[in-house]
Amino acid sequence: WELTILHTNDVHSRLEQTSEDSSKCVNASRCMGGVARLFTKVQQIRRAEPNVLLLDAGDQYQGTIWFTVYKGAEVAHFMNALRYDAMALGNHEFDNGVEGLIEPLLKEAKFPILSANIKAKGPLASQISGLYLPYKVLPVGDEVVGIVGYTSKETPFLSNPGTNLVFEDEITALQPEVDKLKTLNVNKIIALGHSGFEMDKLIAQKVRGVDVVVGGHSNTFLYTGNPPSKEVPAGKYPFIVTSDDGRKVPVVQAYAFGKYLGYLKIEFDERGNVISSHGNPILLNSSIPEDPSIKADINKWRIKLDNYSTQELGKTIVYLDGSSQSCRFRECNMGNLICDAMINNNLRHTDEMFWNHVSMCILNGGGIRSPIDERNNGTITWENLAAVLPFGGTFDLVQLKGSTLKKAFEHSVHRYGQSTGEFLQVGGIHVVYDLSRKPGDRVVKLDVLCTKCRVPSYDPLKMDEVYKVILPNFLANGGDGFQMIKDELLRHDSGDQDINVVSTYISKMKVIYPAVEGRIKFS
């Protein structure tokens, strides 16, 4: 019996087609992805093959103005239109709190939404009961297939699930649910979830009875043969893991942003054992036409976005200096504003010992692309912020050793004075440079804001200590020459859309007046 698994993950509200780098589509003839194009390919496969499942491994939420405006209603609507068969909850599905998951998505999806390792307690337990499930048995042709869901247990640090959801260890939570499926004589079981490629592989190895793992969170690109675009494969597709009980378990993921449609063919014997598995992600490029009816629907929904982008989010009573002349040479108040917004967006009081789990922000000055003049009645719009942060990036959470941070700050000024983008703006950090010293030895003081303290204060950076830092995904990926961050980071979790973080902060503050206050000094 043959099953075709089509899968997406980490789509991050890319409902419209995008450029090759998953930013806003500029030249339509070279654009990729989007739900209209995805629908064309899915329907083509559904017509050609008998047993097809379309699955999503989480993080549909967050990433473009679509999510900012529609808050998840767009996810339910277009996933329903594409007739997804199941979805696992990702960490970003909790970005607007549990209510922001329940109302627009859990109540509106016409397909099951899954997670076995999220347990509700207190008053939420009855409210959310039945709206998401640990597993689902799906009819496929004349057979049934079990799907068991899982979500990163780091979600309380990455999003806003509140205090009434407990995120358990994935493997511990999955095993009894898989066992339950086995007692129901379901012998073909897919683990669908959002904990990253390393956990996907562990699940394949450790959870008895799981036949296939379809993952997300780490934006992992797997491919067999010559890759069709810029993404470099982390391994073959499918990635085969040998389980502790000796089975060959295929593990797949399909990069991110709806650029690819994962395509995996699995052959099962009559006892539900995997005989063979093969496939590859399908690049959704312009050779695949956009479905006209879905495209028309997208255009209808788009109207509200255009209206939103010119509405006032808040006011500034000071000039927001985002000029290259400032932000690439010294502390600029636009950099301070953005870093303060980044920290504010990551406030999670999850431990009595810590006022917050993260206090530090770094931001490449070259990523700040425009100032905002206060003389336009002080008005700040989404459109204004899109000029400041035009690249459609995310502000991510990483863990780094102090020694890596020190290298990053040395890199920040290694060729100071040439208006290069690597000069770092900061939050929760006080840095002093001495430019008379040779490159690589110019940081003379680097103090960081404590987290395990009731009264935050600045202490000298410790080289061997592990710190959490919020930074743009561009830096996490080694951009602007910050190779040491990419090479030495100990953990990396994708965060919220950059403009969304700043716009939310401005809306919350209502009136802003960021200052230059001595975060960056020269001796």
């Epitope: 039945g130 499930l133 689902k136 048995v137 799906l138 009819p139 049934v144």
Partner: nanobody
Framework: ALQLVESGGGLVQPGGSLRLSCEVS????????IGWFRQAPGKEREGVSC????????YYADSVKGRFTISRDNAKNTVYLQMNSLKPEDTGVYYC?????????????????WGQGTEVTVSS
């Protein structure tokens, strides 16, 4: 919370008719496939009929084809099972069940939400 409540069961003579109702609360009916199942004393639960979320597709077990009709009134959040030409072998507890998805099924394993059941006895 999601709830399904069956009603309309009772004692009926062979050849007679009954109309079972299943009222759902806590969710929007048109997002769910609905199935009717029955369990005769000492037997396995068996699928009788099911209706897709849109109501566009309906399926019946061979044993009831031509005699039973499933219908739904999404506005009233209620699903009905019209049972005609009843036979003694139709006796049992009738359950209505629901699940989200695109493909209606008579396989009990795919249903996530169940009612408490209503008893039907066909006897002279």
């Amino acid at each position: 919370a999601l709830q399904l409540v069956e009603s309309g069961g009772g004692l009926v003579q062979p050849g007679g008719s009954l109309r079972l109702s299943c009222e759902v609360s806590g969710f929007t009916l048109d997002y769910y496939n609905i199935g009717w199942f029955r369990q005769a004393p000492g037997k396995e639960r068996e699928g009788v009929s099911c209706s897709s979320n849109s109501g566009g597709s309906t399926y019946y077990a061979d044993s009831v084809k031509g005699r039973f009709t499933i219908s739904r009134d999404n506005a009233k959040n209620t699903v009905y099972l019209q049972m005609n030409s009843l036979k003694p072998e139709d006796t049992g507890v009738y359950y209505c069940a629901a699940y989200r998805g695109w493909h209606p099924s008579l396989d009990a394993r795919v249903y996530d939400y169940w009612g408490q059941g209503t008893e039907v006895t066909v006897s002279s």
